[in-house]
Structures are given as C-alpha cells and as structure tokens.
C-alpha cells in the first residue's frame, strides 16, 4: 500500500476539512504552549503544501514522510527554546528519533490557565462572527490540554460542539439550551481523554502485547458471537489505530479508524447483532457508536471451558505450539462467557493461567499439576467483588461528596508525598465510581467499577511520572498494569512519612470562597482536608470529620457576615488555633 506521496494520500482520503483539523490537533498536542494564531499559520502552510502534492505527487518534498514534514514545520517555530527549553533539542535529531523526542515531551499537566466559559451571548456572537475560527479554537484548546486525546474522537466532539451552538444560539433561552450541552461535552470529553490516556500508557509502558490482551478481552465481551479469528483481526486493526494515535500519527490513525468502522459494518453479521443502528450513522458518529456499543448476547450453548483448557491432554502441546495464540483463545473464551467481569480481572485470570502452564508444562505430570488451576481463580474473582460491595455500601451511606472525602483521607494516608492537587483530583474521580457504577445490578458493577478505577489510577500514574515523589506510587504504577488497583488497595498508612510542617497560609481562606460554585467550594474544602491529613496523618476519621465540620461552619458563618473579609481573617485564626489545640498540629 505504498504511495508516492503520503501527505497527498492522506489529504485525499480524509478531505481538506478533516486534514486541517487533524494537523491542528497534532501540532497543538506537540507544542502545547504555542498561541492559537501560530498553529493556524503552520496548519495553513502544511495544507497548502499538501494541495501541491495532490496536484503533483512528484513535486519537491512530496515524497517525505509525514513525521519529516510535520517535524520540520514544528522546528520552524522561532520561540521554541524560550518556550519549551530542552524540547528544542529534539530539532537537532533525525527521524524517527525526532518524533520520539517530541512524544517524550508531551505534558499531561501543562501549565495553562483554566478554561473560563464566557457569557452565552459572547459565545454566540463569536460563533456567528467566525464559525470556522471558533471551532478551530475549540480543537486547539482541548488538544493542548489533553495531548493524548483520541484525535478522530475529538473531531466527533467538535461536530457536537458545533451542533450545540447552531441549535442553541437561535433558541429563545440560549443559556438553558446551551449550558447543559456544554457541561455534558466537558464531562464526556474528560472521560474520553482519560480512557485514551490509559490506552496510550498501556502501549507505551507495557507494550503491544499488553494492549492486545486488553483488546481481546474487551472485544470478546462485546462480541461474544464472533469467532476467535474475527476477534483477532479486529484486535490487530484496533491496535494499529491506537498505536498510530498514541504515536502522534493522527492522519493515519483517523484514516485507519474509518477503514475499521467500514469493515465492522460490512461484516456485522459475523461480529454482533447490536451494530445495526451504529452502521446507519455518518462516519464520526458511526465510529463513536461502535466504540460504545453494548455487549451482544452470549451464545446460548457455550460448552464448559475446562474441557479445552484443563481436562484435555493436549493443553501443553497446544500451548507450546503457539503460546500467545493459545492464551489469546483462553482469554477470548473466558471473556465472552463473562461480561460480568472487569477486563483487568480477566487479564489477571489469563496471567494466572499462563504462569500455571509455564510451571506445569515443565513438570513430571503436567495434567496433575494444572488440574486445579481454575480453583486459583476464586480468590481473584472474590477480591474485586468484595471491594465493590463494601465501597458501594459506603457510597450509599455517605453520598458522593463525603465518599470522596473518605477516599481523600484513605489515599493521602497511603501516599502522602503526592501533591495535594493530584490527590484531590484523583480522589474526586475515584469517588465518582459510586454514582457511575453502584446503581448498576451486580452483573454490571464490576466491569463498570474496576475498569473505571484503572482509568483513574492511570491519571495518578501519569501525573506522578512527571514529578516522581513516592516509591510506592512508582511501584504500583510500573510493576503490573492489571494489578495497579489491587496494589493501591493493598497499601496501608505510610508509617515512614514525616508529617508536613504546619503552615498557617495553607489554612487561610478569603471571601472569594463565598462566590465559588458548589464544586469549586468542595475542592477548596477537600484541599484543606488533604493538607490536614498531611500535617496530622495519625488523626482519626472522627477527628478529621469534626474539624471539617468546623471548617464548614466557619465558611457558612463568614459568608453570611456583613464584613466577610474581616470575618474570614479573624475567625480563620480562631479556627486554626482551635484545630491546633484539638489535634496538636
């Protein structure tokens, strides 16, 4: 499938609009600090060049790889060294090292201002004045803050963003129409970014085999009627798509994703009965719909797994002939029978099975050795079941905010060295598992909860990797992808931690807290809670709860006061003194 000009090939396949959007996303994900206008200029230059190649594939430089073309373009940015420091050194390298260098400098937590939503009328005016610039700005702002966002999916978000403005800016009550849609896009976007970040971490930190194992398990749950060969083909194609996107090859990724959606829809009879509606949609909606499609019904008469994987005398022979294929078949067969298990649990079971075969197939009596392998699965299955049961009970008792606070205390005591903003962000997200998953029946709880927790803990891992401060976090993040959650669950209070010095400034609050949204006020309180635990890691849950209630009483009192700022100053000192006296801070 060689083309004389790769850039011309992708331009023709994708069309000008998608080509420009994807190049903008790629550039914004690499150079996250560059102003919007600079990126637009670069994208326009690349687009004009691509058009010359479409007209004549033999034209000068048209035969160059996309990495070479894009990298050369990025390296023309005048302020590269001032803005990015050592990233500028990437430009001295040749491809493919230069692209690898750019990838290594992607920042999961860039120092960018929070996106503040303007007034609805202001947004609608901007949308009507220049729709194209308005939508490009959306792509740019999301891409630079989420450097691993799944690019073809971001095109889908942009399409929905445009549709929301098109509809709501004509509505009688613009705000009532638009704001819920924007909130939904924001929340879905954050979730989508985090899910994709886990896929990229899986590929980059644990390799293609780890990603393929995850994909086999997930696709087998989703398409239990599909043959193993069909699932294997889908896994290979899906791995290529995500490898490309995670590697910054966004044009190839989007093109291949479209091909995969086309293939799935052309072969839905041998894949899943649930695809019909998805396949009637336009491309971006179709791909999104397929990615989110519900699990198909399991075939009615699936035989016991034991026959082929335990009782058969050929287990070791089959394993030895093609280890990964045999393990893949085991994973496929187990996963299609267990939509009620999380993907990570299925992968733990497959790993246990693999370890057992490695040991037993070298033993004197292999069959005798592996005969009880399925018994080893029981504790692995029960551990997440029990954990989810306990935590859903706690969530139902406390509600989301206080459940988050319980997790904040739990995780701060486990890894107190982690930065307060990271602990707050991660614990708040961990706490959302309650409202997201506890409402589900038993059969859907585990896949919902544990696979969601994998996504959230990956956020902790990528943020911690940027500035490592805890050996325990590093250990849980790097030892095993599928055992990250059990590893963090097993951590007890860090007895080696030396409590943080008391700093009154940390516990100084101002009248601005009164005008914050409920969410922002919660974050302020939760930040104080983390700091409190860091100062007093031995404080009991009851003490922390009581001090937080004092804090709530203090904020409520001062927000009702005539002279709020004076109240915060005077009563704040009293609150700190009272807490110090009670907790011995």
């Amino acid at each position: 499938d060689a083309h004389k000009s790769e850039v011309a090939h992708r331009f023709k396949d994708l069309g000008e609009e998608n080509f420009k959007a994807l190049v903008l996303i790629a550039f914004a994900q690499y150079l996250q600090q560059c102003p919007f206008e600079d990126h637009v200029k670069l994208v326009n230059e690349v687009t004009e060049f691509a058009k010359t190649c479409v007209a004549d594939e033999s034209a000068e430089n048209c035969d160059k790889s996309l990495h070479t073309l894009f990298g050369d373009k990025l390296c023309t940015v005048a302020t590269l060294r001032e803005t990015y420091g050592e990233m500028a050194d990437c430009c001295a390298k040749q491809e493919p090292e230069r692209n690898e260098c750019f990838l290594q400098h992607k920042d999961d937590n860039p120092n960018l201002p929070r996106l503040v939503r303007p007034e609805v009328d202001v947004m609608c005016t901007a949308f009507h004045d220049n729709e194209e610039t308005f939508l490009k700005k959306y792509l740019y702002e999301i891409a630079r803050r989420h450097p691993y966002f799944y690019a073809p999916e971001l095109l889908f978000f942009a399409k929905r963003y445009k549709a929301a403005f098109t509809e709501c800016c004509q509505a009688a009550d613009k705000a009532a129409c638009l704001l819920p849609k924007l909130d939904e896009l924001r929340d879905e976007g954050k979730a989508s970014s985090a899910k994709q970040r886990l896929k990229c971490a899986s590929l980059q930190k644990f390799g293609e085999r780890a990603f393929k194992a995850w994909a086999v398990a997930r696709l087998s749950q989703r398409f239990p009627k599909a043959e193993f060969a069909e699932v294997s083909k889908l896994v290979t194609d899906l791995t290529k798509v995500h490898t490309e996107c995670c590697h910054g090859d966004l044009l190839e990724c989007a093109d291949d994703r479209a091909d995969l959606a086309k293939y799935i829809c052309e072969n839905q009879d041998s894949i899943s009965s649930k695809l019909k509606e998805c396949c009637e949609k336009p491309l971006l909606e179709k791909s999104h719909c397929i990615a989110e499609v519900e699990n198909d019904e399991m075939p009615a008469d699936l035989p016991s797994l034991a026959a082929d994987f335990v009782e058969s005398k050929d287990v070791c022979k089959n394993y030895a002939e093609a280890k990964d294929v045999f393990l893949g078949m085991f994973l496929y067969e187990y996963a299609r029978r267990h939509p009620d298990y999380s993907v990570v649990l299925l992968l733990r079971l497959a790993k246990t099975y693999e370890t057992t075969l490695e040991k037993c197939c070298a033993a004197a009596d292999p069959h005798e050795c592996y005969a009880k392998v399925f018994d080893e699965f029981k504790p692995l299955v029960e551990e997440p079941q029990n954990l989810i049961k306990q935590n859903c009970e706690l969530f139902e008792q406390l509600g989301e905010y206080k459940f988050q606070n319980a997790l904040l205390v739990r995780y701060t005591k486990k890894v107190p060295q982690v930065s307060t903003p990271t602990l707050v962000e991660v614990s708040r997200n961990l706490g959302k598992v309650g409202s997201k998953c506890c409402k589900h029946p038993e059969a859907k709880r585990m896949p919902c909860a544990e696979d969601y927790l994998s996504v959230v803990l990956n956020q902790l891992c990528v943020l911690h990797e940027k500035t490592p401060v805890s050996d325990r976090v590093t250990k849980c993040c790097t030892e095993s992808l599928v055992n990250r959650r059990p590893c963090f669950s097993a951590l007890e209070v860090d007895e080696t931690y030396v409590p943080k010095e008391f700093n009154a400034e940390t516990f100084t609050f101002h009248a601005d807290i009164c005008t914050l949204s409920e969410k922002e006020r919660q974050i302020k309180k939760q930040t104080a809670l983390v700091e409190l635990v860091k100062h007093k890691p031995k404080a009991t849950k009851e003490q922390l709860k009581a001090v937080m209630d004092d804090f709530a009483a203090f904020v409520e009192k001062c927000c009702k006061a005539d002279d709020k700022e004076t109240c915060f100053a005077e009563e704040g000192k009293k609150l700190v003194a009272a807490s110090q006296a009670a907790l011995g801070l």
């Epitope: 009851e542 004092d550 009483a553 009272a578 009670a582």
Partner: nanobody, 124 residues
Framework: QVQLVESGGGLVQAGDSLRLSCAAS????????MGWFRQAPGKEREFVAR????????YYADSVKGRFTGSRDNAKNTVYLQMNSLKPEDTAVYYC?????????????????WGQGTQVTVSS
C-alpha cells in the same frame, strides 16, 4: 441512638443569669459539634450557639453574642450554656442538639438528635 436531657431552666428577672446543662448518652459524644436552639411561642426554632467537637471553637447568634457562653466537658458527656444579662426576649424553650452528618450548622435540619427542651422565662 442518642439521648439528650436538658436541665437548668427556670423563671428569672431581666439582667439575671442561668446555666443550662445538656447530658448526652448513646452515640459518641466527643466527635460531634453540639448546638443550642430556642423556640419562643408562635415562632420558628432559632439557632443560639454551636460548640465544636473539642470545645475550642464556639459560634453564636448575633442576638446573644457577648452575653451567652457555650462550653462542653467531653469527659462528662455534657454541654453547657451560660446565659448572662438575660432579657425578656430571651424567653423560650431551649433545646440542645447533636450535629448530624450534613446540612447547615445554623439550621435545625443540620442536627440529628434533640433533647426535650427546658423552659427559660425572663420577666421584666
């Protein structure tokens, strides 16, 4: 379950003092803030004072600030309200309450357990 029993109310002259007590039994006492509320005939129940879990921080309604003092003795599971310079408008049934797990610190709905109340009458 928590039982709260108030005592110390009575009939006094304007300008006099009274000391109310509230003895608690049942649920852990020391981990929760305690509140004093009052209800005059035909009026809503209103906040008087909040004494925090350790007795180190007390908030008062503007109408009683400087005259009333709340305190607690966690060893005795008891909370107190010292009322000085009493006025006829302080006449009400006084209730002590244990803080709940949510809601406002200054509203009866934020408190889970209540005593039966003790009458305070201030004559002019």
């Amino acid at each position: 379950q928590v039982q709260l029993v108030e005592s110390g109310g009575g009939l006094v002259q304007a300008g006099d003092s009274l000391r109310l007590s509230c003895a608690a039994s049942g649920r852990t006492f020391s981990g929760y803030a305690m509140g004093w509320f009052r209800q005059a005939p035909g009026k809503e129940r209103e906040f008087v004072a909040r004494i925090n879990w350790s007795g180190t921080l007390t908030y008062y309604a503007d109408s009683v600030k400087g005259r009333f003092t709340g305190s607690r003795d966690n060893a005795k599971n008891t909370v107190y309200l010292q009322m000085n310079s009493l006025k006829p408008e302080d006449t009400a049934v006084y209730y002590c309450a244990q803080r709940g797990d949510s809601g406002s610190n200054y509203d009866p709905s934020g408190y889970s357990y209540w005593g039966q109340g003790t009458q305070v009458t201030v004559s002019s």
